[in-house]
């Protein structure tokens, strides 16, 4: 074969967000008869020629940026896109609210605030049953998410969480739920004005993974603005499809 | 996915066994195996997981001594052994896979267990 | 440990009906809830995974909802093979615990 092996995929299961001492899976998915995986966690030397990790219980250093690939022969992939696994709870909730208020008129405007008592620069917004992230900056303790001309397509419930660029793979705990309710008719769906979502990665059942164990690792954490896609629902277990909206630097 | 356990048992208090659970269908090494017990007409009592990649445990408090987990590659079987069997140990056990830890996907069918003189 | 509390053991319902049972941890399991069915012959299946999550193969019927503490699964058409013992379980914290069940009945 000519030219490099094509790029696995890389997921996090059940979730890319994992609260502090729950439980996630990450899988490296490439095609049938790999000889060998290799995972790895970006900044720092650390890497496993294995190609699954189970953690039981999520720490502060297992947060960050990972990737893997695989041998066949003497050929390597090409490494798969980066998967960023964010460990949550490492701080204080942030509060949610909406202004003017959360029962928006079809085609009207509503701005949801995101607000935390702690100095971080970024805030991340989700809507439960959206599939992918998006980003923006703010500081200065709180964010602003402009929705404008609001469809029915934007009714839901809506979660925040607020972290600093500094450690961008350790956020607070996520606001109580807010509600967003929309009246009226829709025309058509639309999303926030911001950056398209990322592509999403399906697992299949058909993964040739190993076992392998990080949780005895120390970790250091990288600096970077990217925040990736949770992978999307599927039919094995896998991450909450949920839309994010990133507001950052 | 299919996970064959071996069949019922019918011992003696104070003895020992050793419940197996043939993996086919997937690759051994690649999930978890938790092993569930459960009492006549009774719930479901989570007694502890290995990682059969790894053979490393976790156990529920209340069955450390009491069982012990343990897995084969070779023959993609997973292994759990009872010990000092009393009455109390007269139970449906299932092994299962799970994905992730806590979370599990595909059940074996379950081995009865009779402690009796 | 966790305690997780089904508050109906047993349940009749006709055929079509549509069945709510629920769940409750003694804390926040952060959505790490599984619901399980056992029928008759003693098989167990998963039905839905990290609280609303179908699993493969399972009838779209079946549907799921909670955060925090409090959870419930719905059958929206009930069907006679829907017949069982359902099982909510919580994956957040070892060990991992179970409900006592509900056993879902005919009228």
């Known amino acids: 074969q000519s030219g490099p092996l094509p790029k696995p995929s890389l997921q996090a299961l059940p979730s890319s967000l994992v609260p502090l001492e729950k439980p996630v899976t990450l899988r490296c998915q490439g095609p049938p008869g790999v000889d060998l995986y290799r995972l790895e966690k970006l900044s720092s030397s650390r890497y496993q020629d294995q190609a699954v990790l189970f953690i039981p219980a999520m720490k502060r250093s297992l947060a960050g940026r990972y990737r893997c690939s695989y041998q066949n022969g003497s050929l390597w992939s090409l490494p798969s896109d980066q998967l960023e696994l964010v460990a949550t709870g490492v701080f204080a909730k942030p509060s949610l609210s909406a202004q003017p208020g959360p029962a928006v008129s079809s085609g009207g405007d509503v701005t949801l605030q995101c607000q935390t008592r702690y100095g971080f620069d970024q805030f991340a917004l989700y809507k439960e049953g959206d599939p992918a992230p998006y980003k923006n900056p703010e500081r200065w303790y709180r964010a602003s998410f402009p929705i404008i001309t609001v469809t029915a397509a934007h009714s839901g419930t809506y979660r925040c969480y607020s972290f600093s660029s500094r450690d961008p793979y350790l956020w607070s705990a996520p606001s109580d739920p807010l509600e967003l309710v929309v009246t009226g008719t829709s025309v058509t769906p639309s999303r926030l004005p911001t950056e398209p979502p990322s592509p999403v990665a399906e697992f299949s059942e058909a993964t040739a993974e190993l076992t392998v164990s990080f949780t005895n690792e120390v970790f250091t954490t990288e600096t970077s603005r990217s925040i990736t896609a949770s992978p999307k629902e599927s039919d094995s277990p896998a991450g909450p499809a949920r839309q994010y909206y990133t507001k950052g630097n | 996915v299919q996970l064959q356990q071996s069949g019922a048992e019918l011992v003696r208090p104070g003895t020992s066994v050793k419940v197996s659970c043939k993996a086919s269908?997937?690759?051994?090494?690649?999930?978890?195996i938790e092993w569930v017990k459960q009492r006549p007409g009774q719930g479901l009592e989570w007694i502890g997981v290995?990682?059969?990649?790894?053979?490393?445990?976790n156990y529920n408090e209340k069955f450390k001594g009491k069982a012990t987990l343990t897995a084969d590659k070779s023959s993609s079987t997973a292994y759990m052994q009872l010990s000092s069997l009393t009455s109390d140990d007269s139970a449906v056990y299932f092994c299962?896979?799970?994905?992730?830890?806590?979370?599990?996907?595909?059940w074996g069918q379950g081995t009865t267990l009779t402690v009796s003189s | 440990d966790i305690q997780m509390t089904q508050t109906t053991s047993s349940l009749s319902a006709s055929l079509g009906d549509r069945v709510t049972i629920s769940c409750r941890a003694s804390?926040?399991?952060?959505?790490?809830l599984n619901w399980y069915q056992q029928n008759p012959d003693g098989t167990v299946k998963l039905l839905i995974y990290?609280?609303?999550r179908l699993h493969s193969g399972v009838p779209s019927r079946f549907s799921a909802s909670g955060s925090g503490t409090d959870y419930s699964l719905t059958i929206s058409n009930l069907e006679q093979e829907d017949i069982a013992t359902y099982f909510c379980?919580?994956?957040?914290?070892?060990?991992?615990?179970f409900g006592g069940g509900t056993k879902l009945e005919i009228k």
């Open positions: 299962a896979r799970s994905i992730y830890y806590g979370t599990i996907d595909y």
């Open positions: 269908g997937y690759a051994f090494t690649y999930y978890l």
């Open positions: 290995i990682n059969p990649g790894s053979g490393v445990t």
């Open positions: 804390q926040d399991i952060s959505n790490y």
């Open positions: 990290y609280t609303s």
């Open positions: 379980q919580q994956g957040s914290t070892l060990p991992y615990t």
